[in-house]
């Protein structure tokens, strides 16, 4: 099923299993179960770090309720400006009934543009990546991640939001796409298929991978997600393909082993902190980058997508667990939660490495059809 060019030294070749300390089994809700009455020094009195599944629904921001139980934890959070700018809070409280963007699903009515007009935009995601047409940009430097190694406490919320499984990340996970292009990680979630059916969102020369991880980030230039939506570079997503390998991936197992606890739509559990970077490929220097959108409503554009060239390997059993454990809306299995690829409409995908150079002996001269734009600006 893999394309001939998927070798160790070719685009998207070679997996990274990502190791982390094995951590003990966990209990149900703890750390940030409910809005906090008092936050740590330097933080406003805001609700605790909250969900933002998928690149999913933008919540309507509601005032903090006096009753902790009255708030619904959902979807793309709004990050409030904290008392100290260094530590944002992911504030995703909203009432489900009050948000039209909660009423969407994969493969059916209502059409997404009716849910959010931006879904009919010209520069949408995901896209098909054709390495031969990618513009090699030497200015694209290795990604820098800081603070992605988390101790087991505080625990993190893992939630089945009906569209994906999402891990809400605490403040302090910093990512740089390059000088002056700094972001804070908010959440990560996965997209997958079904038995024998791959479910990555992005494709490579038409090839769909078994699954895909997205780590969603907010630019440090913005205090809140709703301020950043639709603004160029306001949000950035790191994406990596997951494919089958011979061994169990211990980093992913820390999440996959907990999926049975959240099989039901809307359920959540708490998992020990882990090395978030171990969920990503080890090679931060080779990637594709383009400007697109959120892949779920509200489909806001201006999102910088960084798709790793290297894949992450999970065992066959792990991929099966991912695609066959969770339930979505209407007593249906949560499967095939990916959006169809969208037209580039003139966009050029950039590569941090010469992805267009074919390793076969036929290519005497590297074929690079697109030139690098102002990468790194």
């Amino acid at each position: 099923q893999r394309l001939p060019r998927m070798q160790e030294d070719s685009p998207l070749g070679g997996g990274s299993s990502g190791e982390d300390d094995p951590l003990g089994e966990e209990d149900l809700p703890s750390e940030e179960d409910s809005p906090r009455e008092e936050d740590p020094p330097g933080e406003e009195d805001l609700p605790g770090e909250e969900d933002l599944p998928g690149e999913e629904d933008l919540p309507e921001v509601k005032p903090k309720s006096e009753e902790e139980g009255s708030l619904k934890l959902e979807d793309l959070p709004t990050v409030e400006a904290p008392g100290d700018p260094q530590e944002p809070q992911n504030n995703a409280h909203r009432d489900k009934e009050g948000d039209d963007q909660s009423h969407w699903r994969y493969g059916g009515d209502p059409p997404w543009p009716r849910v959010s007009p931006a879904c009919a935009g010209r520069f949408q995601s995901p896209v098909d990546i054709r390495p031969q047409l990618a513009a090699f940009c030497p200015a694209l430097r290795p990604l820098e991640l800081l603070g992605f190694q988390l101790p087991p406490l505080p625990e993190l919320r893992l939630r089945n939001n009906g569209h994906s499984v999402q891990l809400t990340l605490p403040p302090g996970l910093e990512m740089a796409l390059g000088p002056g292009r700094e972001y804070r990680a908010l959440q990560l979630h996965l997209h997958w298929g079904a038995a024998g059916r791959p479910g990555s969102e992005h494709t490579v020369e038409g090839h769909r991978f078994p699954a895909e991880i997205h780590v969603v980030h907010l630019s440090t230039a913005f205090a809140r997600v709703d301020e950043a939506l639709g603004r160029p570079g306001g949000l950035a997503v790191l994406a990596a393909f997951l494919e089958e390998g011979p061994e169990e991936n211990s980093a992913y197992e820390q999440l996959l082993s907990r999926l049975e606890e959240i099989a039901e739509e809307g359920s959540e559990t708490q998992v020990p902190g882990l090395d978030i970077s171990a969920l990503l490929p080890s090679d931060f220097s080779r990637y594709f980058q383009y400007e697109g959108s959120l892949t779920t409503p509200p489909c806001a554009q201006g999102v910088i997508w960084t798709v790793f060239n290297q894949t992450v390997m999970l065992s066959a059993k792990q991929l099966h667990t991912l695609s066959d454990t969770l339930w979505g809306p209407g007593d249906s299995r949560l499967q095939l939660n990916f959006r169809a690829t969208q037209p580039l409409n003139g966009r050029v995908i950039e590569a941090s490495f010469p992805a267009g150079v074919d390793s076969s002996p036929r290519a005497a001269e590297p074929v690079q059809l697109n030139s690098c734009l102002a990468a790194g600006d």
Partner: antibody, heavy 118, light 111 residues
């Protein structure tokens, strides 16, 4: 405002037991992991044990594993440390501390002194 | 012997700048875990001074700053004041020990 108040310290013989308590107020107790940190007289800080907000996960320093048990009662906003088989080297001021989302300890109690001596 | 190594003491005159180092290993600071700093004034409980390597809680003067590089971290104090005198501790998490670890502490003396 956040307040943590330890109690239960005192003089105990080697091999004896003691139960420390930490009463918390001013924040949603069940939403935070908590830890015990100790400081022997004239010495530095040593992390002893930690517990998740639900109480479902517990962690211990090697020096106390099998002898100390951390627990919490979220309905009473109280953290506990049950100390058994106490040794002279357990003599210290014991602080309870709240876990910050970054992995540090953002609020500390004033401490309670535990003296293990015959 | 502490997992994180700090100098036992540092000193400086009022108004001066001092730095306190904290050296770890590839299983703690070098692994990427956050470093935090605490101030313990004589006879009092420790107080969080810097969290997440570089961040100051509200109420902590900007004379205090933290940095981290490789397997070590540093706390810098500028414009030294008499009331800064006390013990300073660094702290991180160690994946080999599966434990939260502290430095041995540094006694700051304001001359």
């Amino acid at each position: 405002q956040v307040q943590l108040q330890e109690s239960g310290g005192g003089l105990v013989q080697p091999g004896g037991s003691l139960r420390l308590s930490c009463a918390a107020s001013g924040f949603t107790f069940s939403s935070y992991a908590m830890s015990w940190v100790r400081q022997a007289p004239g010495k530095g800080l040593e992390w002893v044990s930690a517990i998740s907000g639900s109480g479902g996960s517990t962690y211990y320093a090697d020096s106390v594993k099998g002898r100390f048990t951390i627990s919490r009662d979220n309905s009473k906003n109280t953290l506990y440390l049950q100390m058994n088989s106490l040794r002279a080297e357990d003599t210290a001021v014991y602080y309870c501390a709240r876990s910050h989302s970054s992995g540090g300890f953002d609020y500390w109690g004033q401490g309670t002194l535990v003296t293990v001596s015959s | 012997q502490s997992v994180l190594t700090q100098p036992p003491s540092v000193s400086g005159a009022p108004g001066q700048r001092v730095t306190i180092s904290c050296t770890g290993s590839s299983s703690n600071i070098g692994r990427g875990y956050n470093v935090h700093w605490y101030q313990q004034l004589p006879g009092t409980a420790p107080k969080l001074l810097i969290y997440g390597n570089t961040n100051r809680p509200s109420g902590v003067p900007d004379r205090f700053s933290g940095s981290k590089s490789g397997t070590s971290a540093s706390l810098a104090i500028t414009g030294l004041q008499a009331e800064d005198e006390g013990d300073y501790y660094c702290q991180s998490y160690d994946s080999s020990l599966s434990a939260w670890v502290f430095g041995g502490g540094t006694k700051l003396t304001v001359l």
